[in-house]
Interface confidence: medium
């Protein structure tokens, strides 16, 4: 029987309020709004939590029975939908101890994980996973790339009770590997031994100067001469223009600086490769992956353009379960979710389309109208002139 | 700790220009332009990114150009055929991010009244 210590889905309305707690650590925290966003796959299911407001930092979070991971698996997992498109925000969760004060949660409590994805510009589109290892936050030394796009993802985190641990993205594996290796908790295993030091004799070139190789007699010459053809102009005035210089050209002769032929070094040995020895300040920790206390789950974020939506939470200790889990939410809505936007895509193409046309249209009609009035105004300006023709003469017989 | 000093504003008649300005110190992952209109929520109006990438509200965009001056580490709003609902506030966002961190910083603001 899996073990569920959190699960979180939003499907009774209102009822979010009483069981996530706003932090007032700073006035102007983001609101989260329950919504199923502007496409989805079913309204009601795909309900979750929505960042409201742009360029704000966010700090909610839920509380759940305390509980250690000691011995046993410990799977984290959330959808994260950033349906606007996101430029820069996280879409992470943070555990914490039980002894958080929630209404203080802010960018510096101390955690026990933070596990998700991270978008900031071209430079960083990553899920952080962060352990808190006697105090310090301690990165992946893996880059795990992160979905961009405006559709939801599930997100999941495995550690074991054997320092392993797995990241997945939509239920399939991204990441995995031993706690050891991929985040630097412990001191290195081996290390350069002290005491060794590179032979004065150890000769670490491969090639060398042909110590019988010298420099021809010829090789030296300027590398610029007095061009020989040029002459100078016969009106050239040594009293006004100084003495005439021929102009200077690159010497073809010129051979640049010598240097002698490279030929293999007999005393050659390769590089020197500096001994290791054990660690002494190393000794394994066979409980890295260990807390002895789990009691919230926080979204603590800064987002720069809000619509991120969170749902569809887990906390269990069942691999099986949770993928079982992320199935029926997730995996039901996705396909849907993605017709509906698809749908408004188009709708919205055809709407720009007819847009486009009536604009065109409406441009021609007022080109039209004004070729008409320019052509009315040719009219009138035409019949003025036959007139003051007709008028002309007129005049003259009465002069006469 | 980052220091933010905008400055720029004015009043403009509609269809004009006016260029802000926005000087920081301290090493920044993204620069960003907000505004805020009386009585409204503080909206997004363009950033730009340490790689160079930029975003720009569907309100502003075509209108309003944001770059950035390296050597004098000041971003620059350049705002063209201004119009009165541009009216607001504008605000000058510095972020500072670090090992899943985040710190904003925020100018004083200027403010840009399009008027006729």
């Known amino acids: 029987e899996p073990a569920v210590y959190f699960k979180e889905q939003f499907l009774d309305g209102d009822g979010w309020t009483s069981r996530w707690i706003e932090s007032k650590h700073k006035s102007d925290f983001g609101k989260f709004v329950l919504s199923s966003g502007k496409f989805y796959g079913d309204e009601e299911k795909d309900k979750g939590l929505q960042t409201s407001q742009d360029a704000r930092f966010y700090a909610l979070s839920a509380s759940f029975e305390p509980f250690s991971n000691k011995g046993q698996t410990l799977v984290v997992q959330f959808t994260v939908k950033h349906e606007q498109n996101i430029d820069c925000g996280g879409g992470y969760v943070k555990l914490f101890p039980n002894s958080l004060d929630q209404t203080d949660m802010h960018g510096d409590s101390e955690y026990n994980i933070m596990f998700g994805p991270d978008i900031c510009g071209p430079g960083t589109k990553k899920v952080h996973v962060i352990f808190n290892y006697k105090g310090k936050n301690v990165l992946i030394n893996k880059d795990i790339r992160c979905k961009d796009d405006e559709f939801t993802h599930l997100y999941t985190l495995i550690v074991r009770p054997d320092n392993t641990y797995e990241v997945k993205i939509d239920n399939s594996q991204v990441e995995s590997g031993s706690l050891e290796d991929d985040w630097d908790f412990l001191p290195p295993k081996k290390i350069k031994d002290p005491d060794a030091s590179k032979p004065e004799d150890w000769d670490e070139r491969a090639k060398i100067d042909d110590p019988t190789d010298s420099k021809p007699e010829d090789w030296d010459k300027p590398e610029h001469i007095p061009d020989p053809d040029a002459k100078k102009p016969e009106d050239w005035d040594e009293e006004m223009d100084g003495e005439w210089e021929p102009p200077v050209i690159q010497n073809p002769e010129y051979k640049g600086e010598w240097k002698p032929r490279q030929i293999d070094n007999p005393d050659y040995k390769g590089t020197w490769i500096h001994p290791e020895i054990d660690n002494p300040e190393y000794s394994p920790d066979p409980s890295i992956y260990a807390y002895d206390n789990f009691g919230v789950l926080g979204l603590d974020l800064w987002q720069v353009k809000s619509g991120t939506i969170f749902d569809n939470f887990l906390i269990t200790n069942d691999e099986a379960y949770a993928e079982e889990f992320g199935n029926e939410t997730w995996g039901v809505t996705k396909a849907a979710e993605k017709q509906m936007k698809d749908k408004q895509d188009e709708e919205q193409r055809l709407k720009e389309e007819e847009e486009d046309k009536k604009r065109k249209e409406e441009e021609e009609a007022e080109d039209k109208e004004d070729d008409e009035d320019k052509d009315e105004d040719e009219e009138d300006e035409e019949d003025k002139e036959e007139d003051e023709e007709e008028d002309v003469p007129g005049q003259a017989k009465d002069e006469l | 700790q980052v220091q933010l000093q905008e400055s720029g504003g004015g009043l403009v008649q509609p269809g004009g220009s006016l260029r802000l300005s926005c000087t920081a110190s301290?090493?920044?992952?993204?620069f960003g332009w907000y505004r805020q209109a009386p009585g409204k929520q503080r909206e997004f109006v363009a950033n730009?990114?340490?790689?160079?990438?930029?975003r720009y509200s569907d309100s502003v965009k075509g209108r309003f150009t944001i770059s950035k001056d390296n050597a004098k580490n000041t971003v620059y709003l350049q705002m063209n055929i201004l119009k009165p609902e541009d009216t607001a506030v504008y605000y000058c966002?510095?972020?500072?991010?670090?090992?899943?961190?985040?710190?904003?910083?925020w100018g004083q603001g200027t403010q840009v009244t399009v008027s006729s």
């Open positions: 301290g090493s920044i992952a993204a």
């Open positions: 966002n510095a972020l500072v991010r670090f090992e899943g961190r985040n710190d904003d910083y």
């Open positions: 730009m990114y340490v790689g160079g990438s930029i």
